[in-house]
């Protein structure tokens, strides 16, 4: 251990061995539980790179290996042999080596060993009998440890090589620092002037120039605290460690989208054990006090089909926001903690009961000191207007799902929009939520004129009378008649009926549909083929050109390797060939061979293909 | 591992209750041990998104809440009440609700409950005496969805009626997709065949053409999982969403310097909630490469990469042209039986 590691051992810490010699705390591997690939071997290395000075001198090193149907883990810790561990007594605590013994645990294979020489739980030894149960071996795919990454400091070199010697400005040898090193852990540190790390692992930093770092992060889901060693010459989380020379770990906020992010670094032993958020330390930002915190304003509900977001102003400068929401009779629930956004998605709260009236409020806190309060002894906040989703959510733009003509009647169907309101674990549609309160208005008109007619329905279907042989266009609007505001949606996109022409026109229309389908399917693939493309088809050569297009289409089918593309291409070729053969055996002369055509990318190929199909439609 | 949710009950699973009625296996929350924020409340939701059909009909639902100096965990499992669990008998197995009772465990606070109604271990109830420091209680800590359940358990059929299904002119389903959408979050998913996203936000994608995407990244510092909606016509993270039509989110590794990067896309509701690292993709042997490709008459090939799944093209020699309808593509693929990589045979014909 480097000389400075004498941890100013207080009298009450002094423990002696049987000979009366002072017993110093043991050095053990201490990585808690990590995934492991150790299986079916006589011995394994722990792959734990954290060497810790055990807290109490009486503690020994322990390793626990567990295997169940899902995975293998290896746990490395310090533990007091007077106390059981995992309900078992550490019988072998005095052993210099960590010899694994199997213990009875239902539903898993469980081995444990303990030992009392430095880092003795780095090499765990299984008795030979064990290695029978799985003769096929197999290592697994790596986990933590130096095999599988994770944010683990490199293995502690205990022999300090010359090239590790670093001196400070006075020329004195600079020994590696002792830092808390627990990587990322969940934390309960919130809204306090300072917190202890609750990290029990003290590590000797690998390089003498490394300092201690702590990173506190809070998002909608949880709070984490990360404790590590890091070289201040290198950025950490994309930020420079500006405060590396500080003896204390004074938290400063950094900009990270979607979360609140504080970081500090320091260079006294275990200085990242006590992280400080409080104002008196935060000298670098004199404006961050309460005086400059402004209350949110213009709180506005933005809600469509129950997707509900609260928006407010201003964009924060040196402050953060937390939103709370409640029903009139309920408790406040906090959302979007300490956010620098000016919006908060409250959908998951309001969909619990869309007929309730909700109130939200936005709290403003100084960025560096979320404990700070306003003059009245609590943080500044502003209330939102009341919001009743059922009465106020905007109706989203509807979509016409289909229309079908039978004689002089047309049935127009509106898509039942989905919402995020759940009942019995299924998502309800707009119709499910509103029932007969929701009606649709249909506007329809002849393609050839502008005079509109209208009809209403309190289902999602209209049955209207039309003139035979005329094409109509349709648009729908959702309405909730019982409302006084936000009664109507915007109009749906207009959908129009096509004109029926010729016996084989429908085939060609379906060919275009298939081409569109192919285009959609291949856009999610990477097909870089170039294909023979006739981009300027002369009507006298349209059949020849069509045959080239159909040939080249098979290349797309081949190269995609996709069954649905293959089926669509096959279907398209059948349709096209049916229509071509209906014209009899047309012989065209003076037309280009396929191979004489220019090669174009797939997008251009398909566009030209559509054009030639339209040529057939127009003449069918 | 909770058994795969299969709702077809085999004969050998049939058990009858005291009245002779067939007793079907119970549905329970089954997330094993997870960190929890449940503390000092009269009741909590489990925030476990996995609902499992218990393996044996006699099994009941169990929840175990433990608190020590470092953290709080909540364990949710199925268990046979004839057998002790954590060395304790499940005395309350017949209860329809999961009423927590404290048990003696040195060095920690330990509560356990069992119950026998479906998913009854999703809502765990602490007796009033326990809640001494905050007599006003407060509901569960909630989560996404309905009251804290997070994502929809995989076995839930979302009874999408025919009249909800919208088709475009090609008959393809067109309405907007439901996807998990939590952007980038830290993840503990590592070294598993599949993981749940643990994202409680289900979003209706903005555009009907959008699909669900999940991106798993691991570097020296941490692991993140990103869940979003995205239009497969546009690349995401510079990669094309080749698997957008897949109903499942099957992770494929992508090349990104300085990190391990996996991405998947899929087009069934909330399909990016369960991300699958299936063995064939889990680049267990990144060293597999193809031999030099075969020769094709009147064509040459310049191979840029011999690695697995590389796609290369032959080029017809000068004076020759690719015959229409033939493909110049060859791909380095793996023969699963022999574990040997080879180039596929192109259909290319080069003609004068």
């Amino acid at each position: 251990i480097p000389p400075h590691v004498q941890k100013s051992v207080n009298n009450d810490m002094i423990v002696t061995d049987n000979n009366g010699a002072v017993k110093f705390p043991q050095l053990c591997k201490f990585c808690d539980v990590r995934f492991s690939t150790c299986d079916n071997q006589k011995s394994c290395m722990s792959n734990c790179s954290i060497t810790s000075i055990c807290e109490k001198p009486q503690e020994v090193c322990v390793a626990v290996w567990r295997k169940n149907d899902e995975n293998i883990t290896l746990e490395t810790v310090c533990h007091d042999p007077k106390l059981p561990y995992h309900d078992f007594i550490l019988e072998d605590a005095a052993s210099p080596k960590c010899i694994m013994k199997e213990k009875k645990k239902p539903g898993e294979t469980f081995f444990m060993c303990s030992c009392s020489s430095d880092e003795c739980n780095d090499n765990i030894i299984f008795s030979e009998e064990y290695n029978t149960s799985n003769p096929d071996g197999g290592g697994g795919s790596g986990g933590g440890g130096s095999g599988g990454g994770g944010s683990i400091p490199p293995h502690v070199q205990k022999s300090v090589n010359n090239d590790m010697i670093v001196t400070d400005n006075n020329g004195a040898v600079k020994f590696p620092q002792l830092c808390k090193f627990c990587d990322v852990r969940f934390s309960t540190c919130d809204n306090q002037k300072s917190c202890m790390s609750n990290c029990s692992i003290t590590s000797i930093c690998e390089k003498p120039q490394e300092v201690c770092v702590a990173v506190w992060r809070k998002n909608d889901e949880n709070i984490t605290l990360e404790t590590v060693c890091h070289d201040p010459k290198l950025p950490y989380h994309d930020f420079i460690l500006e405060d590396a020379a500080s003896p204390k770990c004074i938290m400063k906020e950094k900009k990270k989208p979607g979360e609140t992010f504080f970081m500090c670094s320091c260079s006294s032993d275990e200085c990242n054990d006590n992280i400080i958020f409080s104002e008196e330390y935060n000298t670098s930002n004199p404006d961050s006090g309460t005086t400059n915190t402004v209350a949110a304003y213009n709180l506005t509900w933005k809600s469509t089909n129950f997707k509900t977001i609260l928006e407010w102003e201003p964009k924060p400068v040196n402050q953060v926001y937390t939103v709370q929401i409640s029903t009139k009779s309920g408790d406040w629930k906090s959302k979007c903690f300490y956010t620098t956004d000016t919006e908060c998605d409250l959908t998951d709260e309001i969909v619990k009961d869309v007929k309730q009236t909700y109130l939200a409020r936005v709290f403003s806190y100084p960025a560096g000191n979320v404990e700070s309060t306003g003059s009245a002894g609590e943080p500044l906040y502003e209330n939102s207007p009341e919001f009743t989703p059922y009465l106020e959510t905007n109706l989203g733009q509807p979509t016409i799902q289909s229309f079908e003509q039978v004689g002089t009647k047309v049935n127009v169907t509106v898509e039942d929009e989905r919402t995020l309101v759940r009942r019995n674990n299924t998502f309800l549609s707009l119709r499910d939520v509103f029932g007969k309160d929701l009606i649709y208005t249909l506007y329809y008109w002849k393609s050839s004129s502008s005079g509109k007619k209208t009809a209403k329905t309190n289902t999602n279907e209209f049955l209207i009378d039309v003139d035979k042989g005329e094409n109509y266009c349709f648009s729908v609007q959702a309405v909730i008649p019982s409302r006084t505001v936000n009664r109507k949606s915007t109009d749906s996109p207009v959908e129009c009926m096509g004109q029926e022409k010729g016996e084989f026109r429908e085939n060609w229309v379906n060919v275009i549909s298939d081409l569109k389908k192919i285009e959609d399917l291949i856009q999610s693939m990477h097909i870089d083929a170039t294909l023979y493309t006739e981009s300027d088809v002369h009507p006298s050569c349209k059949v020849t050109a069509m045959k080239c297009f159909l040939l080249e289409l098979q290349v797309i089918s081949l190269e995609s390797g996709d069954a649905s593309i293959h089926d669509t291409v096959e279907n398209l070729i059948i349709l096209a060939n049916n229509s071509l053969s209906s014209n009899g055996n047309v012989t065209e002369s003076g037309c280009k061979e396929c191979e004489e055509l220019e090669e174009k990318n797939i997008k251009e190929f398909l566009q030209s293909f559509v054009h030639i199909v339209q040529m057939f439609i127009n003449t069918s | 591992i909770p058994p795969h949710v299969q709702k077809s009950v085999n004969n050998d699973m049939i058990v009858t209750d005291n009245n002779g009625a067939v007793k079907f296996p119970q549905l329970c929350k089954f997330c094993d041990v997870r960190f929890s924020t449940c503390d000092n409340q009269k009741s909590c939701m489990s925030n476990c998104s996995i609902t499992s059909i218990c393996e044996k009909p006699q099994e009941v639902c169990v929840a175990v809440w433990r608190k020590n100096d470092e953290n709080i965990t909540l364990e949710t499992v199925c268990h046979d009440p004839k057998l002790p669990y954590h060395d304790f008998i499940l005395e309350d197995a017949a209860s329809p609700k999961c009423i927590m009772k404290e048990k003696k465990k040195p060095g920690e606070t330990f509560f356990m409950c069992s119950c026998s109604s479906d998913e009854c271990n999703d809502n765990i109830i602490f007796s009033e005496e326990y809640n001494t420091s905050n007599p006003d209680g407060g509901g569960g800590s909630g989560g996404g969805g309905s009251g804290g359940g997070g994502s929809i358990p995989p076995h839930v059929q979302k009874s999408v009626n025919n009249d909800m299904i919208v088709t475009d002119n090609n008959g393809a389903v067109k309405f907007p997709q439901l996807c998990k959408f939590c952007d980038v979050r830290f993840s503990t998913c590592d070294n598993q065949k599949s993981c749940m996203s643990n994202c409680s936000i289900t979003s209706i994608c903005e555009k009907p053409q959008e699909v669900c995407v999940a991106v798993w990244r691991k570097n020296d510092e941490n692991i993140t999982l990103e869940t979003v909606c995205h239009d497969p016509k546009l690349p995401y993270h510079d990669f094309i969403l080749e698997d957008a039509a897949s109903p499942k989110c099957i992770m494929k590794e992508k090349k990104k310097p300085g990190e391990t990067f996996f991405m998947c896309s899929c087009s069934s509701d909330e399909c990016n909630d369960n991300i699958i690292f299936s063995e064939e993709y889990n680049t267990s042997n990144p060293d597999i490469t193809c031999p030099p490709p075969m020769s094709v008459e009147h064509a040459d090939i310049w191979v840029k990469s011999y690695s697995l799944y590389s796609r290369e093209r032959y080029i017809c020699n000068s004076g020759f042209k690719r015959k229409a309808g033939t493909s110049s593509l060859t791909e380095c693929v793996l023969n699963k039986a022999t574990n040997v990589a080879h180039w596929t045979t192109p259909s290319l014909k080069c003609i004068r």
Epitope: I439, T454, A455, Q477, P481, R483, V485, N486, R487, K488 | -
Partner: antibody, heavy 117, light 107 residues
Framework: QIQLVQSGGEVKKPGASVRVSCKAS????????VYWVRQSPGKGLEWIGY????????IYDQNFKGKATLTVDKSTSTAYMELSSLRSEDTAVYFC??????????WGQGTTVTVSS | DIQMTQSPASLSASVGDRVTITCLAS??????LAWYLQKPGKSPQLLIY???NLADGVPSRFSGSGSGTDFSFTISSLQPEDFATYYC?????????FGQGTKLEIK
């Protein structure tokens, strides 16, 4: 309270045009369609057409196409109906009304248009 | 276009009488029907919407029934102020036609 206030009566010569206004107050103007209804002396009610102030869509009865033109000014919450090429048979009381989709719940007081040479 | 046939065209009754007016649609209109009352020199006033629903502030002696093509409107006990002309209107599809009216007079 909800009110629809119409402009005063007009006397016009045949062939002329007239513009009748209907000022709405007490509700969100763009949330409700405005209907126009005619009542000739001693006759029943005839539906002329409506306008949706939200999107500007107009629907007319076939008999009033080319006769009536419906417009709105959202800034003043006012609906207008212009009648062109007036003839003696256009002499009537013209009502505007608020449409709640299932019925007409509030009506203007009516505007009498007299066409006489 | 949907024709609305209202009957009777006129009706004499006394205070306290029960009176029923019917309205027949030329094609089905579900429940998209409204009833109005109009007094001489006044604007029409909404009584019933969606075939059966009483409008705000309308006394409960007025009621409506029917769906599809056959509708009726009833005043359970005539009051002096109820003598007026009554109209039905279909609001199902344009043109939104009115019945020709029923004039209710004092006997």
């Amino acid at each position: 309270q909800i009110q629809l206030v119409q402009s005063g009566g007009e006397v016009k010569k045949p062939g002329a045009s007239v513009r009748v206004s209907c000022k709405a107050s007490g509700y969100s103007f763009t949330d409700y369609n405005v209907y126009w209804v005619r009542q000739s002396p001693g006759k029943g009610l005839e539906w002329i057409g409506y306008i949706d102030p939200y999107n500007g869509i107009t629907i007319y009865d076939q008999n009033f196409k080319g006769k009536a033109t419906l417009t709105v000014d959202k800034s003043t919450s006012t609906a207008y109906m212009e009648l062109s090429s007036l003839r003696s048979e256009d002499t009537a009381v013209y009502f505007c009304a608020r449409d709640v989709t299932t019925a007409l719940d509030f009506w203007g007081q009516g505007t009498t248009v007299t066409v006489s040479s | 276009d949907i024709q609305m046939t209202q009957s009777p065209a006129s009706l004499s009754a006394s205070v306290g009488d029960r009176v029923t007016i019917t309205c027949l649609a030329s094609q089905t209109i579900d429940t998209w029907l409204a009833w109005y009352l109009q007094k001489p020199g006044k604007s029409p006033q909404l009584l019933i919407y969606a075939a059966t629903n009483l409008a705000d502030g309308v006394p409960s002696r007025f009621s409506g029934s029917g769906s599809g093509t056959d509708f009726s409107f009833t005043i359970s006990s005539l009051q002096p102020e109820d003598f007026a002309t009554y109209y039905c209107q279909q609001v199902y599809s344009s043109p939104f036609t009115f019945g020709q009216g029923t004039k209710l007079e004092i006997k």
